[in-house]
Structure formats: structure tokens, C-alpha cells
């Protein structure tokens, strides 16, 4: 199965010489970035990137690891230290605060410095930190948020919200005492904290009053509106902008994205998180790639540029379930969105960053043969004389005892999208991991992304590259042809 040409040293020497030639030609751009895009793979640690690369290659009937992901083509790479102020291993709220606002916070808080305390409403005021997206809006750019989770979820919320509890999606989730103290739910903050031009993802139910049936699942009461304050936040948002449009399915999204009269677009395609890519009804729900394209079509109309946050948010969910098939297929769709965005933008004026908020206790090992399925078994048996998969988790729901022992596994089981890879420790949900994650960069000022950095550095690179606060005196030449 090994390609014959790879047995020849010339193959590797020639390949490396080409890579070296490309590296020698890299020239740091001295211009400012007109546009900023941050692609956030939630839970996309380096082991996830590697396994997804192999799967993407195998999907194309190649052996696997020799394939390039779209993110692999970005010329600059750094490592990001993901810890939060109070935890070695962080959550998506504290990390969002770091890479979107440039300040580290505490576990499960969003858009607040570490002086704020989880779940303590009265520690909110005065501890708010401002996102790069907010600063981009103040500078006259258009801004957008795209995610496969709820738009009120921790990662996207870092772009616009300030909350001591990431779980306060709608007012029904906020304790009465906190509501009385003035703490607002995340959905309310989505429409009131700042003017966001494009909002695409899941999370319909948090926007509508309790008892409002969902348009897609009208007979399922649990999918309907959750709000106790009687507010229709979508209606309130539409009333703010003459060119605003709300859509809830793929067809409407594609129409709206091509309509020149639409200036603001909100698309909420599921009551909660969007479906996994493998379960998505492609007639009703758009893919992450399609949402990204729609957002770029609208945002790129602004001559002053744009800021766009794009999240592959369910990579994380697949890992928490210990279902590597789900995590990896979500990662591939995330990478497809990166590739599409690259086709629709220019690296001359657009700084694109790809990173993860944190990793997962997901491993890839066992000396599998080249070309063997990424979902397959390691050669040979373990000490208990049973097979084991090359993909495993350190902890999680994949820990199962059968007759007091680890169950055997066959290849026909391990390939199933429902299969949970085994783990060493039993938990209801697999956990995040604390190792550094990669940051990939391309475009103006991408060369600043180097070395081992705090996660907060990401927000500062974006702000500096686009000459946003606090770097308005950035002393970067505007790109030729940039209009104001």
C-alpha cells in the first residue's frame, strides 16, 4: 500500500526543497488588514487536526496523512496557552474572552475580567471587557457571527456578551435574584449590546416567548420559545434596522444573501444547536460552509471592511460524547468553510486566523499501518488479548465494563458514527484537555503569529492588524485601494 515513489529519497528531498523555496519567499506584509476573520474550531486540539487531516484524505480515497487541510496551507503558526485565570484546563467561555477580548477571565464567565466571579451577578458591572468585534464595529466595519451551535453559546457570546454564567441563554435560565440585580440573559445581549450585521447559527428558542411554537417543530413543545419576559427578540431586532431580515431555513438564507436590500441578516436554523453535519437535513439547514459564504457576501459590501467570527462549534460536542466520527466530520466541514472563505476573500487585505479554544483528551496512536482507516483498530492485541482502536479518549462515556472487563471491539463496530471510543476513566461527558492549541494565520500581519503565546495574544494581533483600539496608532500602511 506504500507509494513506491516514497521509497526514493529524491521524493522527500524534492518535496522539502519546494517547501523551503516557498518559505524563503514569505514576506511580512507591512499593510493593515481591512478585514478580519477568526475561525474557531471548538475543542479542535492538534490531535483532532491530525486525525481530521487523515480522514479528509481518506474521504478522497487517498492514504490520509499526506493530504493538506485548508488550514494547513496558512503560512504562519503559533501555539496558544489556553488556561483560564482560575483553571489549568479551561471552558469555552473563559477562552472566548481571551481570544476575542484579549483578557483572560474565569471558568464559565464570558466577556468579563477575572475580577468577576462565576454565577455572582453583582460582580459583573465594571469588569466588562470589550471584544475586537465590538471595536471593529465602532471603527465602521460590518461584523458577523456564524456558528453551528446556538448563537448564544459560549464561544460566539464572547464577541458581544458580558455574563458571569455562560448558561444564561434566555431569561428563563437566569435566577430571579440575578434578574432583579440587572443581569441580562445572553439572547437579550445579542440584540442590545451592539449592532451585529450578520448572525447565523442555532438558538431560536431563546429568542421567543414561552409557548411560541417552533416553525420547524410546531408539535414539539420542548422546542418552542423559552422566554419568560414575553419578549420576541427577533421582532425587536428587526425593528432596529430597515434592511433587516430574519430567516430560519436554508432556502431563505440563500435568497437573503443575494438580496441587495438586506443590510442585516439573522438566521436561526434550529431551536438549540444546529444538527451535526452527518445528521443535517440539507434541504432545511445550511452547512457551515454555506453560512460562511452567505455572511461573506453580505459583509464584504462594506468598503471599510468587516470582522467575521466563524465557529465549528460541534467538534467539541462530538468529543464530549466520545464519538470521534462526529468530531472529525465536524472538523472537516469546518475546514471546508475555511477553504470557501479563502476563495471569497483576498489575503492581500484579509487577516484570517484559525485556532481552537481548547483541546480534548483525544488521542491517536497504536502504530496503525499507513492507509488504514482512521476509525480502525491498532495492529495486534492489547495485554487483555482484545483489540483496541487507534482513536481513544483519556476519560469519558466510552468507558464500559462487560462482565467486569473492557469489551472487545471489531472494525465493523468502530466505524459506526454512533461508536464511542473507549476511555480509561468513566465520565458522563469527556473533558477538555489543557495542552496548547495551534493558531494558523494568513494575510496582513499574519507574521506576528509565531512562537508560544498566551491565548489573549490572538485578540491583540487582530486589533493591531486592523488598527483598532488600543492600536489606532498602529503605523501600518493602508492597503492600496482601501476606501474609507
Amino acid at each position: 500500500i506504500i507509494p513506491v515513489e516514497e521509497e526514493n529519497p529524491d521524493f522527500w528531498n524534492r518535496q522539502a526543497a519546494e517547501a523551503l523555496g516557498a518559505a524563503k519567499k514569505l514576506q511580512p506584509a507591512q499593510t493593515a488588514a481591512k478585514n478580519l476573520i477568526i475561525f474557531l474550531g471548538d475543542g479542535m486540539g492538534v490531535s483532532t487536526v491530525t486525525a481530521a487531516r487523515i480522514l479528509k484524505g481518506q474521504k478522497k480515497d487517498k492514504l490520509g496523512p499526506e493530504t493538506f487541510l485548508a488550514m494547513d496551507r496558512f503560512p504562519y503558526v503559533a501555539l496558544s496557552k489556553t488556561y483560564s485565570v482560575d483553571k489549568h484546563v479551561p471552558d469555552s467561555g473563559a477562552t472566548a474572552t481571551a481570544y476575542l477580548c484579549g483578557v483572560k477571565g474565569n471558568f464559565q464567565t464570558i466577556g468579563l475580567s477575572a475580577a468577576a466571579r462565576f454565577n455572582q451577578c453583582n460582580t459583573t458591572r465594571g469588569n466588562e471587557v470589550i471584544s475586537v468585534m465590538n471595536r471593529a464595529k465602532k471603527a465602521g466595519k460590518s461584523v458577523g457571527v456564524v456558528t453551528t451551535t446556538r448563537v448564544q453559546h459560549a464561544s460566539p457570546a464572547g464577541a458581544y456578551a458580558h455574563t458571569v454564567n455562560r448558561n444564561w441563554y434566555s431569561d428563563a435560565d437566569v435566577p430571579a435574584s440575578a434578574r432583579q440585580e440587572g443581569c441580562q440573559d445572553i439572547a437579550t445581549q445579542l440584540i442590545s449590546n451592539m449592532d451585529i450585521d450578520v448572525i447565523l447559527g442555532g438558538g431560536r428558542k431563546y429568542m421567543f416567548p414561552m409557548g411560541t411554537p417552533d416553525p420547524e417543530y410546531p408539535d414539539d413543545y420542548s422546542q418552542g420559545g423559552t422566554r419568560l419576559d414575553g419578549k420576541n427578540l427577533v421582532q425587536e431586532w428587526l425593528a432596529k434596522h430597515q434592511g433587516a431580515r430574519y430567516v430560519w431555513n436554508r432556502t431563505e438564507l440563500l435568497q437573503a444573501s443575494l438580496d441587495p436590500s438586506v443590510t442585516h441578516l439573522m438566521g436561526l436554523f434550529e431551536p438549540g444547536d444546529m444538527k451535526y453535519e452527518i445528521h443535517r437535513d440539507s434541504t432545511l439547514d445550511p452547512s457551515l460552509m454555506e453560512m460562511t459564504e452567505a455572511a461573506l457576501l453580505l459583509l464584504s459590501r462594506n468598503p471599510r471592511g468587516f470582522f467575521l467570527f466563524v465557529e465549528g462549534g460541534r467538534i467539541d460536542h462530538g468529543h464530549h460524547e466520545s464519538r470521534a466520527y462526529r468530531a472529525l466530520t465536524e472538523t472537516i466541514m469546518f475546514d471546508d468553510a475555511i477553504e470557501r472563505a479563502g476563495q471569497l476573500t483576498s489575503e492581500e487585505d484579509t487577516l484570517s486566523l484559525v485556532t481552537a479554544d481548547h483541546s480534548h483528551v483525544f488521542s491517536f496512536g497504536g502504530y496503525p499501518l499507513r492507509g488504514s482507516s482512521i476509525f480502525g483498530l491498532a495492529p495486534g492485541k492489547a495485554r487483555d488479548r482484545k483489540a483496541y482502536t487507534v482513536l481513544l479518549y483519556g476519560n469519558g462515556p466510552g468507558y464500559v465494563l462487560k462482565d467486569g472487563a473492557r469489551p472487545d471491539v471489531t472494525e465493523s463496530e468502530s466505524g459506526s458514527p454512533e461508536y464511542r471510543q473507549q476511555s480509561a476513566v468513566p465520565l458522563d461527558g469527556e473533558t477538555h484537555a489543557g495542552e496548547d492549541v495551534a493558531v494558523f494565520a494568513r494575510g496582513p500581519q499574519a507574521h506576528l503569529v509565531h512562537g508560544v503565546q498566551e491565548q489573549t495574544f490572538i485578540a491583540h494581533v487582530m486589533a493591531f492588524a486592523a488598527c483598532l483600539e488600543p492600536y489606532t496608532a498602529c503605523d501600518l500602511a493602508p492597503r492600496a485601494g482601501t476606501t474609507d
Epitope: S373, I374, S412, G415
Partner: nanobody, 121 residues
């Protein structure tokens, strides 16, 4: 989800031919590699043939030159043309789908219910 439904099995004499079909329910059928496996009574399920997204094809040594796999993306269907059948080809034949030929030939994601092929001598 991908639902797979096989058809075309039956009883045939040694040296005869059969054509198995497998219809898939998902619109993105062309993204998947498709394969056939078989399980004879009392034996493990074994790989027979697979056809990838790119059209690349693999066969088990035991069926090379006798069986031909093909696909019609417009009809979301994969076929297995079986010629020069032998009694040892008797088995339940399963259709499978996976992300690429490497995956489908080793660890398919989706399986059909199977169709019985019996070759009499």
C-alpha cells in the same frame, strides 16, 4: 444518516451470474465510498469489493476477475455484478457506506440489512 437497501440476491447454479443492487437514501451519496461485504454461515463477515468517491476500486483476491463493482450517482445506487459464481460464494451480502475507500473497506459507517446469495452445485 444513510439508509442502504440491498436487492438482487437469490438462488443460482454454479457458473451462473447475479447482479446485486444497493440503493442509498442520502442525497450526498456521491460523497461516500460504497462497498460490499459477505458473511457465510459460521464465518466472519469479509470484504468483497469497494468503489471510492474518486472511482478507485478495490476487490478481495477471492473475487478478482469474477465480480465487478460499479455505481450510478444519479440513481444513488451501487451494483455488484457477480459472474462465474462458485458454491463458496454462498453468503449473505451486505452493502456498506463510508468516508472513502480506505474507510469503507475496513470500518464502514453504515450497513444494509443484507441479501442472501445461494450458489448450488
Amino acid at each position: 444518516q444513510v439508509h442502504l437497501v440491498e436487492s438482487g440476491g437469490g438462488l443460482v447454479q454454479a457458473g451462473g451470474s447475479l447482479r446485486l443492487s444497493c440503493a442509498a437514501s442520502r442525497r450526498s451519496f456521491s460523497e461516500y465510498a460504497m462497498g460490499w461485504f459477505r458473511q457465510a454461515p459460521g464465518k466472519e463477515r469479509e470484504f468483497v469489493a469497494a468503489i471510492g468517491w474518486s472511482g478507485v476500486i478495490e476487490y478481495a483476491d477471492s473475487v478478482k476477475g469474477r465480480f465487478t463493482i460499479s455505481r450510478d450517482n444519479a440513481k444513488d445506487t451501487v451494483y455488484l455484478q457477480m459472474n462465474s459464481l462458485k458454491p463458496e460464494d454462498t453468503a449473505v451480502y451486505y452493502c456498506a457506506a463510508g468516508l472513502g475507500i480506505r474507510v469503507v473497506s475496513q470500518t464502514p459507517a453504515y450497513w444494509g440489512q443484507g441479501t442472501q446469495v445461494t450458489v448450488s452445485s
